[in-house]
Structures are given as C-alpha cells and as structure tokens.
C-alpha cells in the first residue's frame, strides 16, 4: 500500500493490517493475498501459491509468492529438497562433493559451488575426516605405502627397487647391494 502510515488495528491478535477500509487478517504460509477483507478484522481472500512459487511466512500480507530458486547446474548444485508452497528449494551438493563458498564471510544464503571431494584412497592415504561441509581430510599413507615428497609411494615388491630410510621404516626392509 502507498503512504507511510501504519494505523493500529483494534483486532484480536497481532496479525491484522489496515488494507483500505478495514483491518484484515493475514494469510497462512503457502498462500498469497488475493483480495482484502470486506469487514472489520475479517479474513482476507488468500489463495495457494502457484507451482514453482512459495511463501514461508505465517500471517503475512504479501500479494505475490516468491519464485522458487533453481539450483545452479553450472556450479554442480543439486536440489536436496524440492520447492513446496511453504519452503524454497534447498540446494546443496551431491554425495562425494562439498560446498565451496564464493565469498569470504560464508552464510547459508551465500553463493557457492560444489567441488568433488578428495579421494584419499586414490591418493593411497587414510581418510581422517569424511568430506561433507569441507573437503576430505586425508591422513597418513595406507599400509604398503610410504611418504615420499607430497605423495604416498608403494613399497617395493622386490629387492631390486631402492628403499630409502623412510621406506625401510614403513616397508620393513633395507635395500641390498
């Protein structure tokens, strides 16, 4: 409504608002305000939100439902919960992927993209923390592998291979000359 006034409504409960002649009750979640009430403290005409729109608030006076968000496929997002008349689509990442926020101060409504989780097994490492809200945290090398540089190297299977000190400590034998 135009103007800046917000007249007080002498109606039972706090969910009334002056719309034209009368103070009208608000609409329930999942509905939008189609027509004002036609008597004091009366019920507004409220209709169910059309498909692909929603309104999450109770006792509101919104005349339009909000459009449901579409999950960003370019950012590898998927719908964890589909949109309903009372709740927006909940976007997230599919199993094996984690949320990477696109802003430094990350909140639930911040833009994000999905990154594939690190596969510790493929790196021949123990999984210390499973990937969900952040990337997988990999631990030490799996049995039969030893630390070499940034990676895990397979223990030699024959005495012909070289086995530095760290290899020997993990793999349990020294190179023979």
């Amino acid at each position: 409504q135009g103007g800046t006034r917000s007249p007080r409504c002498d109606c039972a409960g706090d969910f009334h608002k002056k719309i034209g002649l009368f103070c009208c009750r608000g609409c329930p979640a999942g509905h939008y305000l189609k027509a004002p009430c036609t008597e004091p403290c009366g019920n507004s005409t409220c209709l169910v939100c059309p498909q692909d729109t929603f309104l999450a608030w109770e006792n509101h006076h919104n005349s339009e439902c909000a459009r449901c968000q579409a999950c960003d496929e370019q950012a590898s997002q998927v719908a964890l919960e589909n949109c309903s008349a009372v709740a927006d689509t909940r976007c997230g990442c599919k199993p094996g992927w984690f949320v990477e926020c696109q802003v430094s101060q990350c909140v639930s409504s911040s833009p994000f993209y999905c990154q594939p989780c690190l596969d510790c097994g493929a790196l021949h490492r123990h999984t210390r923390l499973l990937c969900s809200r952040r990337d997988t945290d990999c631990g030490t090398c799996l049995p039969g592998f030893y630390e070499h540089g940034d990676g895990c190297v397979s223990c030699p299977t024959s005495t012909l291979g070289s086995c530095p000190e760290r290899c020997a400590a993990v793999c349990g034998w020294r190179q023979m000359f």
């Epitope: 103007g3 027509a35 004002p36």
Partner: antibody
Framework: QVQLVQSGGGLVQPGGSLRLSCAAS????????MNWVRQAPGKGLEWVSY????????YYADSVKGRFTISRDNAKNSLYLQMNSLRAEDTAVYYC??????????????????WGQGTLVTVS | DIEMTQSPSSLSASVGDKVTITCQAS??????LNWYQQKPGKAPKLLIY???NLETGVPSRFSGSGSGTDSTFTISSLQPEDIATYYC?????????FGGGTKVEIK
C-alpha cells in the same frame, strides 16, 4: 457480463416509504460487498450504505441512519434498500454499486467497479 | 468524516488540450483514492483506482498520481467523448466520501 438492474423508484410523499431493488447477474453475487450511492438533482455523488457479502457488516451515512435499511438475498442475487420516513432532501437518483477489491504487485485496491442504471426517487 | 475538496468545479478546454483536476483530502488517505467519470444521464464509471492505476479498458490518456492528502487526475489529450463530470472518492475510511465533482466541457 456483469449487470445490475434496478427497480422500485418513484414518487412518494414526505414521511412515506419505498423499497429499491437491485438484481445482479453475470458474477457470483454472494462473494461481493455492495453499496447504495445517491445523487440529488444537479448535485454530486453521496454514499448511502454498505453491506458485506454475508450481510454481517452494514454501514450507513449519518443522513439516513435509523430511516434506511440495506439488505440482500444471496439466493435471489438481489440487493435492497428499504427507505422509511422519507424527506424532501432524499430526492435523488439512487445507484447500487458492486464493491470489488483485489491485491496485486504489493498493493491492494478497492472500488465500485460496476453500477446499476439508477432509479429516481422523488419525495414531494 | 474525511472531506474531499475537488478543484476546479468546472473547466472548458479544447480538443487535444491537457486537462488537470486536483483532489485534496482533509487527512492522509494514503493511496486509497479512486476517480470516476459520469456522463450526463449515466451511472458513474470507475477510471482509476488506488490513485494511479488504470482500470481495464480505460484509455491511456487518463492518468492519476499522488498520495497522502493530494491527488491529481490528468487527461493528456482531451477528446470529445471525455465530456463528463469527474469525481474523486476516498476509501481510507467509512463513510466513503466523494469530491464535489469537476464538470469538463469542450470549448
């Protein structure tokens, strides 16, 4: 299409009574509030009375309070105005008018969107 | 009661002229204002609701503006069929009240 057809006007003596009718068609009469508005000869428009769709809310202008009675019969799609103790100053063309309201784009609107053809009441 | 003061009470203009009518409420009525057109011997017709919204089927030469206590009704280019009396009406409060009307004539 929406139509409001009025009847019941005429000449009446001061102190007399008259009943105006307004027959509605082309819309769901029981869903709308209705009004009576009058216009004295050569004068402007004056609101007379309001009745909600279910008849639970009724209002009158001070000038007719206690003398006029608005009513409706949703089964017959009809609106009425019973006028008693008529005075010379009640002489006017009386209109019935539908009160419509709707909300869109963050605002709500109300107004008399359809009117009857009018019926002349002469008190003399 | 909310008093609606409309001016001028009458005006005469040429075809094609811009015509402006003002309506002043005795208190803040927000946007709760309608404009009606009444041709001689006919019932009024709703032209503009909520101060500035054109009713369906009404020519775009008609417009309205304003909020609070002051509202304006404009005919951008007067046509012979616009000869009528125009009324503003508030619906902020009961009783519903109309302005005194503005009679528009062609020179």
């Amino acid at each position: 299409q929406v139509q409001l057809v009025q009847s019941g006007g005429g000449l009446v003596q001061p102190g007399g009574s008259l009943r105006l009718s307004c027959a509605a068609s082309g819309f769901t009469f029981s869903s709308y509030s209705m009004n009576w508005v009058r216009q004295a000869p050569g004068k402007g428009l004056e609101w007379v009375s309001y009745i909600s769709s279910s008849s639970s809310t009724i209002y009158y202008a001070d000038s007719v309070k206690g003398r006029f009675t608005i009513s409706r019969d949703n089964a017959k799609n009809s609106l009425y105005l019973q006028m008693n103790s008529l005075r010379a100053e009640d002489t006017a063309v009386y209109y019935c008018a539908r009160w419509d309201g709707y909300c869109s784009g963050g605002s709500c609107y109300s107004g008399m969107d359809y009117w009857g053809q009018g019926t002349l009441v002469t008190v003399s | 009661d909310i008093e609606m003061t409309q001016s001028p009470s009458s005006l005469s203009a040429s075809v094609g002229d811009k015509v402006t009518i003002t309506c002043q409420a005795s208190q803040d009525i927000s946007n709760y204002l309608n404009w009606y057109q009444q041709k001689p011997g006919k019932a009024p017709k709703l032209l503009i609701y909520d101060a500035s919204n054109l009713e369906t089927g009404v020519p775009s030469r008609f417009s309205g503006s304003g909020s609070g206590t002051d509202s304006t009704f404009t005919i951008s280019s007067l046509q012979p069929e616009d000869i009528a009396t125009y009324y503003c009406q508030q619906y902020d409060n009961l009783p519903l009240t109309f302005g005194g009307g503005t009679k528009v004539e062609i020179k």
